[in-house]
Interface confidence: medium
């Protein structure tokens, strides 16, 4: 079957990297510099993505492979195929249309993308508040207050809050 | 907040050329691509090209090459295209809008291109 | 060039209605973009790289698939909804998009 389809199609011979040039009888040429073909029995490359600006190359083109593109230090990639990138904001801010702005009280990002999220209500949980937000951190709930009144169970207090990386004092 | 402000319509006669501009404003112009898209009435979106207005870079869909050219002033934060050798087939509404990869949400309002002797 | 397919080429809908509409490519595309266009404005971008909610795009909306086949999903009809769809490929120059799906409000 396949020596059948080739006889018919010569173009079928042509392997990824090449395309059937019509303007040659029909012969495999190498794709021409800046472009790629990914698959066999192309007619045409495809022209290379230019990673420029916001973009930085990640995987550079090759004749079989499109380029890849990620983001330059400052931004992220938004989607995954990174096709946006989308400026930092410190921890503690976020992304406006009017450029970063500090989380709202109440609000809270520790990421440089994404949205301040409301601090978690740990009363919900029937908790208390251990260690207060900030704009950069989330409340930490602690055990509820009747866990801490005279005559309840013993419970162990839990360690102080602390950053991760830091050794206790 | 980005904005994208293109020039207004244009009653043009056949053979003729238009050069319309889509001024940029809200971002660092220079780092961002720029494309046109053209919609004809009642008709669907056609992308005709693409620049890089940093060092000039463009491409083109081949539909559009020798009809569409591409330029962009970095100091007024300008894109332009220029249509030549207009016939009714060139009357639409084009449009131009920022660009990374895809087009990234921020678009002109469009312009009104006539053709008509 | 990739060529994109969309169907249905006009559809209609009741209000909290569920719609879907697809998007076929000619040849395997990693990426989609859906934009919504009304009559006299320009388009708004909805969903890119398949399936992320551009910003400000109502939660209703959502995007799938994936190869050839992909997908825009409306998962109650609104109103305000009623407008033609495109889905759009950035992957391959040049960029091409679908010929459009006109939603209708019944």
């Known amino acids: 079957f396949e020596r059948t389809r080739s006889l018919q199609d010569p173009c079928s011979n042509c392997p990824a990297g090449t395309f059937c040039d019509n303007n040659r009888n029909q012969i495999c040429s190498p794709c021409p510099p800046n472009s790629f073909s990914s698959a066999g029995g192309q007619r045409t490359c495809d022209i290379c993505r230019q990673c420029k600006g916001v973009f930085r190359t990640r995987k550079e083109c090759s004749s079989t492979s499109n380029a890849e593109c990620d983001c330059t230090p400052g931004f992220h990639c938004l989607g995954a195929g990174c096709s946006m990138c989308e400026q930092d904001c410190k921890q503690g801010q976020e992304l406006t249309k009017k450029g970063c702005k500090d989380c709202c009280f109440g609000t809270f990002n520790d990421q440089k993308r994404g949205i301040c999220r409301p601090w978690t209500n740990c009363s919900l949980d029937g908790k208390s508040v251990l260690v207060n937000g900030t704009k950069e951190r989330d409340v930490v709930c602690g055990p509820s207050p009747a866990d801490l009144s005279p005559g309840a169970s013993s419970v162990t207090p839990p360690a102080p809050a602390r950053e991760p990386g830091h050794s206790p004092q | 907040q980005v904005q994208l402000q293109q020039s207004g319509a244009e009653l043009v006669r056949p053979g003729s050329s238009v050069k319309i501009s889509c001024k940029a404003s809200?971002?660092?112009?220079?780092?961002?691509?720029m494309n046109w898209v053209k919609q004809r009435p009642g008709q669907g979106l056609e992308w005709i090209g693409q620049?890089?207005?940093?060092?000039?870079?463009?491409n083109y869909n081949g539909k559009f090459k020798g009809k569409a050219t591409l330029t962009a002033d970095k100091s007024s934060s300008t894109a332009y295209m220029q249509l030549s050798s207009l016939t009714s087939e060139d009357s639409a509404v084009y449009f131009c809008?920022?660009?990374?990869?895809?087009?990234?949400?921020?678009w002109g309002q469009g312009t009104t291109l006539t053709v008509s002797s | 060039q990739i060529v994109l397919t969309q169907s249905p080429t006009i559809m209609s809908a009741s209000p909290g209605e569920k719609v879907t509409m697809t998007c076929s490519a000619s040849s395997s595309v990693s990426y989609i973009y859906w934009y919504q266009q009304k009559p006299g404005s320009s388009p708004r971008l909805l969903i890119y790289d398949t399936s992320n909610l551009a910003s400000g795009v109502p939660v209703r909306f959502s995007g799938s698939g994936s190869g050839t086949s992909y997908s825009l999903t409306i998962s109650r009809m609104e109103a305000e909804d009623a407008a033609t769809y495109y889905c759009?490929?950035?992957?391959?120059?040049?960029?091409?998009f679908g010929g459009g799906t006109k939603l209708e409000i019944k």
């Open positions: 809200g971002y660092a112009f220079s780092i961002y691509w």
């Open positions: 809008a920022r660009g990374q990869l895809g087009l990234d949400g921020y």
């Open positions: 620049i890089y207005p940093g060092d000039g870079y463009t």
């Open positions: 759009q490929q950035w992957n391959i120059y040049p960029y091409t």
